[in-house]
């Protein structure tokens, strides 16, 4: 099949002790090979500070996956979700202020 770029959606959920969990979801992409990782100041976080979901079929002939990490509240601006898929790439910020999600379709 032809390449279908991912929808990337970044959300955050509050947790205790001044930390938040940020989750980056990529969905509706094909083929299944994808790089999804959290960066701090543009530098990839170490693997042991990130959690990845499996790359799974989403029922439409395309795939979905996610990566999450925990960050200190107030430092959201330093973090981006980096995506590479089929020669395309993008960085996706953690939503700031009252916005709790951000999504973008790659073309």
């Amino acid at each position: 099949g032809s390449t279908v770029p991912p929808m990337v959606n970044v959300t955050c959920s509050e947790v205790s002790e001044g930390n938040i969990t940020v989750t980056c979801r990529a969905s509706s992409f094909y083929p299944r090979n994808i790089t999804l990782t959290w960066r701090q100041d543009g530098v990839s976080l170490s693997h042991n500070t990130q959690q990845w979901g499996d790359v799974l079929p989403d029922g439409n002939g395309t795939y979905q996956t996610w990566v999450a990490t925990r960050i200190r509240q107030g430092e959201e601006q330093r973090f981006t979700c980096y995506m590479e898929h089929s020669g395309n790439h993008g960085t996706h910020p953690v939503p700031s202020g009252n916005s709790h999600h951000h999504h973008h379709h790659h073309h």
Partner: antibody, heavy 118, light 108 residues
């Protein structure tokens, strides 16, 4: 081969502004942050700020927030540092650098000497 | 701001000797965020060691790094003539990003 090529040396008078350019090659320009660092003669390294060329997000060292402006031109894959209200203490070599996969500064430009003198 | 203090300021050694450079942080840093750079006169800095102990591409095995918390070390097991330079540690854990003031390794 990854390279970052900077503009040439500048001599400026106190109170003026300077704009230094940095043109990376050998990788996708929007995939890595561009950092700026300066080094006064005989001194250590001082981080000025960085820009994410893909989304345009800029993070400054608070010490430079009022006088430094970081920009990118995606059409020419070039990053810029503009420093205003120059004073003699701003005389330094200004470096651009690329964020790496595992470190903040993995490739560096050759540096641009900015001399501020009346 | 995390202040990085490097010691000694200058290290005078002969080729073949072992060099031990220290970097002390004013607050604890995760080892993932401590890096070392080498700078020779008239040149740009060059990444030497990333994340405390990992050699950057093309860096000889005589260089090694270690440490945790507030105390980090760069070791050159046997100095070669091309190793005489200034070495900087740098932290990326907290903003502002900061460098140590440098240790100059000079020929004795």
């Amino acid at each position: 081969e990854i390279q970052l090529v900077q503009s040439g040396a500048e001599v400026k008078k106190p109170g003026a502004s300077v704009k230094v350019s940095c043109k990376p090659s050998g990788y996708a320009f929007t995939s890595n942050n561009i950092y700026w660092v300066r080094q006064a003669p005989g001194q250590g390294l001082e981080w000025i700020g960085y820009i994410d060329p893909y989304i345009g997000r800029i993070i400054y060292n608070q010490q430079f927030k009022d006088r430094a402006t970081l920009t990118v031109d995606k059409s020419t894959s070039t990053a810029y540092l503009e420093l205003s209200s120059l004073r003699s203490e701003d005389t330094a070599v200004y470096y651009c650098s690329r964020s790496g996969e595992r470190s903040n500064f993995d490739y560096w430009g050759q540096g641009t000497l900015v001399t501020v003198s009346s | 701001e995390i202040v990085l203090t490097q010691s000694p300021a200058t290290l005078s050694l002969s080729p073949g000797e072992r060099a031990t450079l220290s970097c002390s942080a004013s607050s604890s840093i995760s080892s993932n965020y401590l890096h070392w750079y080498q700078q020779k006169p008239g040149q740009s800095p060059r990444l030497l060691i990333y994340r405390t102990s990992n050699l950057a591409s093309g860096v000889p095995a005589r260089f090694s790094g270690s440490g945790s918390g507030t105390d980090y070390t760069l070791t050159i097991s046997s100095l070669e003539p091309e190793d005489f330079a200034v070495y900087y540690c740098q932290q990326g854990g907290s903003l502002p990003l900061t460098f140590g003031q440098g240790t100059k390794v000079e020929i004795k």
